[in-house]
């Protein structure tokens, strides 16, 4: 959960407010209480954002872009609060806002710099392209341009491709990494310096498992303590890759503690789930169960991917029948 907005105090009656796209923010302004209060909020010294005087709003000449998006804290004006409540900020709202307050005893002017950030939750994806394997860190909408770093076995990687597409108000970014034939663990970090928000994706490949037909297999999936916070909402998904595409076997939502299972031979241990262990069992294996199994634990702040490769071999009985 993130605050409505946060303030950074800078000199000369100027504050910086950082807001998030489509969220509501407060542009702060205070004055020494007095009668006959007049409040004018303006954008870039040109556009009328909000006017209040003689005890009520006067929005006849308000710039249309602010219509139905602004209000004051009317019960607190008499106590010296001229702050502006600003709904659904967009990147076009970035800039300098001036609050003019006049009373029977004084006039003050405050400047507030509004910066707007975007950080739609990134994702880490594992993809097969022909014979190559790729990890892709991507963020659908981010502003300003983020810092993306990759690590292999905790060592920074200098090679860092970034595919960027810019829309009117934000960037969409993909950062693919070729991991063909690697058994290393990988980590991708995406940082939005304005919102002071960091997301981390971590990929781990487990040793391959060889099983006989009709046996069962246990696949481990436990979050790394560095990232995992059980109080935070997260989702766990187990899926199997077949011919280049993943099909979901089961998933668990921490918010509702719901488990949904799509494969009847799949089982989860409730006791273990309560201990944040999302290891699973797949019973009665058959040859078509061979493949890659992916456990994805995701929250707003991280994605943890664990890959298991399972080889199912025919049992002796089946082999002798053939």
């Amino acid at each position: 959960i993130f605050p409505l907005a946060f303030f950074i105090y800078v000199p000369m009656n100027e504050q910086i407010v950082i807001g998030r796209l489509d969220e509501d923010i407060i542009l702060p302004s205070s004055f020494e209480r007095g009668s006959e209060v007049v409040i004018h909020w303006k954008y870039q010294d040109s556009y009328k954002v909000h006017s209040y005087y003689k005890g009520s709003d006067h929005l006849e000449s308000q710039d249309p872009r602010y219509a139905n998006r602004t209000s004051l804290f009317y019960n607190e004006i008499q106590n010296g609060n001229a702050s502006l409540f600003f709904r659904r900020v967009s990147l076009l709202d970035e800039g300098i806002y001036t609050c003019y307050v006049g009373t029977a005893i004084q006039v003050i002017t405050n400047k507030v710099v509004l910066k707007v950030g975007v950080f739609l939750t990134p994702v880490m994806k594992y993809e097969k392209r022909n014979t190559n394997s790729f990890l892709i860190c991507s963020v659908l909408s981010v502003y300003p341009r983020p810092i993306i770093t990759w690590k292999m076995d905790n060592t920074p990687i200098s090679e860092n491709n970034m595919e960027e597409t810019g829309s009117l108000d934000s960037f969409s970014i993909n950062s693919p990494l070729n991991i063909t034939g690697s058994n290393s663990s990988y980590e991708c970090t995406i940082e939005n310096s304005l919102l002071k928000q960091t997301w981390t994706g971590r990929w781990t490949m487990k040793d391959g498992l060889h099983k006989m037909q009709s046996e069962h297999v246990s696949l481990s999936c436990q979050p790394v303590n560095d990232y995992f916070s059980p109080n935070q909402d997260f989702k766990v998904t187990w899926s199997r890759m077949k011919s280049g595409t993943f099909s979901v076997l089961a998933y668990y939502l921490s918010s509702s503690q719901n488990t949904i299972i799509n494969e009847s031979r799949f089982s989860w241990n409730k006791e273990l789930i309560n201990q944040s262990d999302f290891s699973m069992n797949l019973m009665d294996l058959n040859l078509s169960d061979s493949g890659e199994y992916l456990c994805n634990i995701s929250s707003d702040e991280y994605t943890l991917l664990t890959i298991h490769t399972v080889h199912v071999e025919p049992s002796q009985e089946t082999a002798s029948h053939n």
């Epitope: 003019y100 006049g102 029977a104 002017t109």
Partner: antibody, heavy 121, light 107 residues
Framework: QVQLVESGGGVVQPGRSLRLSCAAS????????IHWVRQAPGKGLEWVAV????????YYADSVRGRFTISRDNSKNTLSLQMNSLRAEDTAVYYC??????????????WGQGTLVTVSS | DIQMTQSPSTLSASVGDRVTITCRAS??????LAWYQQKPGKAPKLLIY???SLESGVPSRFSGSGSGTEFTLTISSLQPDDLATYYC?????????FGQGTKLEIK
């Protein structure tokens, strides 16, 4: 202390133009709305026009709308009233007066000494 | 426009008297009313704003009251220096309008 000094008054023929000025000092000019108020000889007071602190809003009395234009130069602390198509009934002492704040309140905390405009053929 | 009507037009009173001037608006103006004093040959001076708030530096013998359409200016104890014409003014809405004035004479 707050000072408002009007100038530019004089005798002018009907239909002609005149420009009044008001020089302000002793306060932050760009923080306050300024009005023009006039008073015909031996008569009462009549509000003429207002311009807001930032020049964004201007309002006029019906009797002068379309003929008079109020303007300000915040860098020079001056206010002007351009009066066109003058009529005999525009004869008056013209005062510039400072609003309590931005110009939005509409009453007059400080006044200049006035300048006389006489419209006569 | 909102019409402002003052009464009386002229008032004669003695030093020390309590004097009341009335101002009536043609429609409700809430409390958005100011009173001014103008001495002969001088610019007006603000006495009262928002119907009852005393402007800084104005003697406390001046007071204002009323709201809506009926307002009064009271001088609790008339002084020789109070010889002047008094104007009410509404600032509820454009166009701002003044009363016709009340001329106060000292007996």
């Amino acid at each position: 202390q707050v000072q408002l000094v009007e100038s530019g008054g004089g005798v002018v023929q009907p239909g002609r133009s005149l420009r009044l000025s008001c020089a302000a000092s002793g306060f932050t000019f760009s923080d306050y709305g300024i009005h023009w108020v006039r008073q015909a000889p031996g008569k009462g007071l009549e509000w003429v026009a207002v311009i807001w602190y930032d020049g964004s809003d201007k309002y006029y009395a019906d009797s002068v709308r379309g003929r008079f234009t109020i303007s300000r130069d915040n860098s020079k602390n001056t206010l002007s009233l351009q009066m066109n198509s003058l009529r005999a009934e525009d004869t008056a002492v013209y005062y510039c007066a400072r609003d309590r704040s931005s110009g939005a309140m509409g009453y007059f905390a400080y006044w200049g000494q006035g300048t006389l405009v006489t419209v006569s053929s | 426009d909102i019409q402002m009507t003052q009464s009386p037009s002229t008032l004669s009173a003695s030093v020390g008297d309590r004097v009341t001037i009335t101002c009536r608006a043609s429609q409700s103006i809430s409390s958005w009313l100011a009173w001014y004093q103008q001495k002969p040959g001088k610019a007006p001076k603000l006495l009262i704003y928002k119907a009852s708030s005393l402007e800084s530096g104005v003697p406390s013998r001046f007071s204002g009251s009323g709201s809506g359409t009926e307002f009064t200016l009271t001088i609790s104890s008339l002084q020789p220096d109070d010889l002047a014409t008094y104007y009410c003014q509404q600032y509820n809405s454009y166009s701002y309008t003044f009363g016709q004035g009340t001329k106060l004479e000292i007996k």
